[in-house]
């Protein structure tokens, strides 16, 4: 059988290194030898390259080496396969070296900001030594912020006469670290160099960008003062590495700027104690280059009626997100503040908040929330400077079975009845919404019975028991993930009715 005809011939000119062609089939079953015939010097010369040599690399690849690599030039390439049965030649292919030239990557030697020019980095590089001197090179510059996985790209060309190998990358974020890498190719070539080694540079700092400001209103104290927990953070879209030196806060009762008080802090939270009137609060951040725009917040009077417009709210889980959606009766409201924090028996250690604009839903990645924890989520409508009544819900991003079952006791033990009571499982051990409780009970050496009740029931009267019989009992609390049994208790029904008899039970 003749060898297969060599096809899919592809050639690449590694500038001043070699001219390499590959083809298929890459592996011949039988005893096959390949020869590559080349014409060069615009057809005036010819030579041959063969796969049978001492460095038997890829069987379906052959390289022509200097000094017979001439550039510029047009080559013809034909691959010949020979086995014991004969010879098969490929079609003749035609190659313009300028179109298939691959050069070394450039070397970036600096990525620096230019004094006084905001949001720009100047990249300087060395043109590859192994590149044709007279040719225009095209470049792709890839860049990303240091903590991002996503590259952005910009393309440009440089004439050979541009000895200044620099590029100004603009419209960046202020005071942000960027990673850069560069590749190049002769303008007519289809093959790019590899990427250069990465280099890092930081854009110039600017005055802070702005703040998002929020508050938690706490109940008034005995002396009538209201604690208000202020909190602020960099505005959405602020530069990643913007660095504030501190924050200035000033506040006063509405229509009475004479009573302005000021606070300076380096924290991103501050507790104020305000009177019962309406107050206005202002916060700016500052650094060595100046101040941010002012963030403003109106704290309503203690007796102010707040508007209510959220009619319903749903929390649902997708594969990797928690999505909260709400319905509003006020179409003019298009800004909302979302608060979320773990529902724990003690004071929540982490409290988070985020502004939502021009949407009636809020999304958070599941991995930003802890599994098996219940989160309180509240949404406040914001209309200009007024904050409306919140609407709240609870959600788990992942439910599990409770860490402990209910603590149970038997009360009012009678001849044929008993009242079972149990305590709610502590929030920290629920691991999900309790759907129901199941009471399992059985007489000594008897059949087990069960009774399931809703999650809002914490007491149940069992009837039709057998007199003067020992029973064991436990209560299981169930979430969507499954149930966990509480401790087993034992009790014995009475032989005759003792209305004033106290029965001691075991846990």
């Amino acid at each position: 059988v003749l060898p297969a005809k060599p096809e899919n011939i592809s050639c690449i000119f590694y500038y001043e290194e070699n001219f390499t062609c590959t083809w298929s089939p890459e592996k011949e079953a039988s005893y096959t030898w390949y020869k590559v015939k080349r014409t060069y010097s615009y057809g005036y010369k010819s030579d041959i390259c063969s796969t049978d040599n001492s460095t038997r690399g890829n069987h379906a690849s052959c390289s022509f080496l200097p000094p017979t690599i001439t550039n510029p030039d047009n080559y013809t390439i034909q691959v010949e396969a020979q086995n014991a049965d004969g010879i098969m030649k490929s079609d003749i292919t035609y190659w313009n070296l300028d179109a298939i030239m691959k050069i070394e990557p450039p070397e970036i030697f600096s990525v620096k900001s230019v004094l006084g020019i905001k949001r720009m980095l100047q990249i300087k590089w060395i043109r590859p030594v192994l590149a044709p001197h007279s040719s225009t090179l095209k470049y792709t510059l890839r860049f990303r912020t240091i903590n991002s996985a996503y590259w952005m790209e910009v393309n440009f060309t440089k004439e050979d006469i541009d000895r200044d190998e620099t590029y100004n990358l603009t419209e960046l974020q202020a005071f942000t670290e960027y990673v850069m890498t560069l590749r190049c190719a002769p303008a007519e070539s289809m093959f790019w160099s590899g990427w250069s080694q990465e280099k890092v540079g930081t854009t110039e700092e600017e005055a802070p960008y702005g703040l998002d400001l929020w508050r938690v209103l706490k109940p008034a104290m005995v002396d009538g003062r209201r604690p208000v927990q202020l909190m602020w953070k960099k505005a959405t879209g602020a530069p990643v590495l913007e660095k504030a030196l501190g924050y200035n806060i000033w506040y006063f009762p509405e229509n009475n700027t004479n009573l302005t008080e000021t606070v300076n802090t380096t924290n991103q939270t501050h507790e104020l104690y305000l009177g019962g009137k309406t107050y206005w609060v202002y916060v700016v951040s500052y650094n060595s280059l100046g101040e941010s725009p002012v963030a403003t917040l109106r704290i309503p009077a203690l007796n102010e009626k707040t508007f209510q417009c959220i009619e319903a709210m749903q929390a649902c889980l997708t594969q990797d997100q928690l999505v909260v959606e709400w319905q509003s009766s006020a179409p003019e409201v298009d800004t909302w503040m979302v608060e979320w924090f773990p529902d724990v028996d003690s004071e929540p250690s982490s409290f988070s908040w985020e502004s939502v604009s021009q949407a009636r839903n809020w999304t958070i990645q599941k991995d930003e929330l802890k599994p098996l924890w219940c989160y309180n989520i509240s949404v406040y409508p914001v209309l200009r400077d007024r904050v409306g009544q919140p609407y709240s819900t609870q959600a788990y991003v992942q439910e599990g079975i409770p860490s402990a079952g209910p603590v149970t006791q038997a009360d009012s033990i009678g001849v044929k009845t008993v009242t079972i009571t149990w305590k709610e499982i502590p929030k920290s051990k629920r691991n999900g919404f309790i759907k129901n409780y199941t009471i399992f009970y059985q007489a000594e050496d008897g059949k087990e019975f069960s009774k399931t009740v809703n999650s809002n029931i914490l007491q149940y009267r069992l009837e039709s028991l057998t007199r003067r019989t020992s029973y064991s009992l436990q209560v299981m609390a169930s979430t969507n993930a499954g149930g966990t049994n509480g401790t087993k208790i034992n009790f014995k029904t009475l032989s005759i009715s003792h209305h004033h008899h106290h029965h001691h039970h075991h846990h």
């Epitope: 015939k37 030579d47 390259c49 049978d52 040599n53 001492s54 049965d85 004969g86 010879i87």
Partner: antibody
């Protein structure tokens, strides 16, 4: 200038052996496949053997397979053919030729097989 | 094996005359695998035409080759004295690689 010079031809008895050599110059010997072609006394040309440039692949017609062995020494730019179990029909002028297709031929060396 | 039959075996032509000789294969040969050689008495064969129609280096342009499949030919547009020789066709496609019996061209 490409030059191929054959040697080793002789008068040999049937069943005997002979080794032909071909010294190459004027081109990169290790890049080219090489062949032996013979011309019988009645002027017919016959392909006898082919070897790849590195010597890994060898090809023969059935008429000589198992009796003739083509080989090469790229360090010495020399092609060889070991012939054994010679028959009277092997009598011919033997030429070494550069492949792709045979484009350059030597002047030949004469082999006569006769008792 | 592919048998190549050349005709005529011997032919003579006057100087300036157009000459055509043929080579017929017993089974199809690709056009890029059919070659012609020229041999003069006392010399080794020289590659004359390769891949059916391409003239080897130094071959006068009065020579041409054509053909496909099983039928090939060599033509001299105007015979000259130095063209007197034996011409062999050769297929370098299927093993065993074979040669035609030759056409001997003489001057009339």
């Amino acid at each position: 200038e490409v030059q191929l010079v054959e040697s080793g031809g002789d008068l040999v008895k049937p069943g005997g052996s002979l080794k032909l050599s071909c010294a190459a110059s004027g081109f990169t010997f290790s890049s080219y496949g090489m062949s032996w072609v013979r011309q019988t006394p009645d002027k017919r040309l016959e392909w006898v053997a082919t070897i790849s440039n590195g010597g890994s692949y060898t090809y023969y017609p059935d008429s000589v397979k198992g009796r003739f062995t083509i080989s090469r020494d790229n360090a010495k730019n020399t092609l060889y053919m070991q012939m054994s179990s010679l028959k009277s029909e092997d009598t011919a002028m033997y030429y070494c030729a550069r492949n792709e297709p045979p484009d350059y031929w030597g002047q030949g060396t004469s082999v006569t097989v006769s008792s | 094996q592919i048998v190549l039959t050349q005709s005529p075996a011997i032919m003579s032509a006057s100087l300036g005359e157009r000459v055509t000789m043929t080579c017929t294969a017993s089974s199809s040969v690709g056009s890029s695998y059919l070659h012609w050689y020229q041999q003069k008495p006392g010399s080794s064969p020289k590659l004359w035409i390769y891949d059916t129609s391409n003239l080897a280096s130094g071959v006068p342009v009065r020579f041409s080759g054509s053909g496909s499949g099983t039928s090939y030919s060599l033509t001299i547009s105007s015979m000259e004295a130095e063209d007197a020789a034996t011409y062999y066709c050769h297929q370098y496609h299927r093993s065993p690689y074979t040669f035609g019996g030759g056409t001997k061209l003489e001057i009339k």
